[in-house]
């Protein structure tokens, strides 16, 4: 069964800036990635970015930079200023549409004990089941 992992990190340089990384563990070819916050896409969440492997990338404030890291993982940097900026307990969700497996989603938020001075672990963590 495919799985999706989500990692949320606060930037050490800008304490109100976040980096969200998401990846897909499955055999299919990814046709679309949707990143949202405040809950799952289609269930109360607000879309931050949509990444298509060929059509390109669309993003909405406070998203600053969405990009493909690998063929099966993406990253998104969020601006930290303004009324729509995220807070420490904001939930971020990533949904991967993969052919032919379908759509798989996982959500994550900043770990409670986050220290912005610590670097990200070398492997994406936590890994969440897409359920």
């Amino acid at each position: 069964t495919p799985e999706v992992w989500v990692q949320v990190r606060m930037e050490a340089t800008e304490l109100s800036s976040f980096t969200i990384r998401c990846g897909f563990l499955g055999s299919g070819s990814i046709s679309l990635v949707t990143v949202s916050w405040g809950g799952p896409n289609g269930a109360g969440g607000t879309t931050l970015a949509v990444l298509h492997p060929e059509r390109g990338i669309r993003q909405w404030a406070p998203a600053r930079q969405a990009r493909w890291e690998t063929q099966s993982s993406i990253s998104l940097i969020l601006e930290g200023s303004g009324a729509s900026s995220p807070c420490a307990n904001t939930t971020f969700c990533c949904k991967f549409a993969s052919f032919p497996e379908g759509s798989w989603e996982a959500c994550g938020s900043l770990p409670p004990s986050s220290d912005p001075g610590l670097s990200a672990p070398p492997t994406p963590a936590p890994i969440l089941r897409a359920d």
């Epitope: 069964t1 070819s29 046709s31 679309l32 799952p40 896409n41 289609g42 949904k95 549409a97 052919f99 032919p100 497996e101 379908g102 759509s103 798989w104 989603e105 089941r129 897409a130 359920d131």
Partner: antibody, heavy 120, light 107 residues
Framework: EVQLQQSGPVLVKPGASVKMSCKAS????????MHWVKQSHGKSLEWIGI????????SYNQKFKGKATLTVDKSSSTAYMELDGLTSDDSAVYYC?????????????WGQGTSVTVSS | DIQMTQTTSSLSASLGDRITISCRAS??????LNWYLQKPDGTIKLLIY???RLHSGVPSRFSGSGSGTDYSLTITNLEQEDIATYFC?????????FGGGTKLEIK
């Protein structure tokens, strides 16, 4: 409004082939996968396969490999299914259904169905 | 393949009733369970996806619940237009598979 309009009923002889259509409107065909589903008379639903209209990739239920062929014509926003070597077991109603592109992997909009009757 | 079982093939109820239709998967499907209704004319509509999320335009008297292998669809305050056959479908693995259906009739 999302709509899937399927072609009309057909009566075909055993051994023949049939090609049915499913015209999509109210959305861009290439943005959603398309499923095909079989319903024999008074029975449950059987998943035949799925096509990605963006690039034509397909995946079939093992049971229907060699029986069904899924294609799309992007210019007319139409998906097609061809059934070969028809027998009485292929007499059924066939539905096209749009993939929801949401978790759950549901089929959120369905065509009205195409009735196929195989009889000599 | 994942087998989907709807043990009740037909159900009789009165208008205004609350009814529950059950569906069991042969393995854990992690909430990847969807519910459809099929009207007597053959029209099929999605009601619930991902176990409990209401599809757009579906009345709130429909609700879904469950986890693991066991799921259910509940209709409260049954209306005449709810007379249909209800199917569950798993979206967890290929091939997609459906339950045998539960036909709802009015007493």
């Amino acid at each position: 409004e999302v709509q899937l309009q399927q072609s009309g009923p057909v009566l075909v002889k055993p051994g023949a082939s049939v090609k049915m259509s499913c015209k999509a409107s109210g959305y861009r065909l290439t943005d959603y996968y398309m499923h095909w589903v079989k319903q024999s008379h008074g029975k449950s639903l059987e998943w035949i396969g799925i096509i990605n209209p963006y690039n034509g990739d397909t995946s079939y239920n093992q049971k229907f490999k060699g029986k069904a062929t899924l294609t799309v014509d992007k210019s007319s926003s139409t998906a097609y299914m061809e059934l070969d070597g028809l027998t009485s077991d292929d007499s059924a109603v066939y539905y096209c259904a749009r993939d929801s592109s949401n978790v759950g992997n549901a089929m959120d909009y369905w065509g009205q169905g195409t009735s196929v009757t195989v009889s000599s | 393949d994942i087998q989907m079982t709807q043990t009740t093939s037909s159900l009789s109820a009165s208008l205004g009733d609350r009814i529950t239709i059950s569906c069991r998967a042969s393995q854990d499907i992690s909430n990847y369970l969807n519910w459809y209704l099929q009207k007597p004319d053959g029209t099929i509509k999605l009601l619930i996806y991902y176990s409990s999320r209401l599809h757009s335009g579906v009345p709130s008297r429909f609700s879904g619940s469950g986890s693991g292998t066991d799921y259910s669809l509940t209709i409260t305050n049954l209306e005449q237009e709810d007379i249909a056959t209800y199917f569950c479908q798993q979206g967890h693995a290929l091939p997609r598979t459906f339950g045998g259906g539960t036909k709802l009739e009015i007493k």
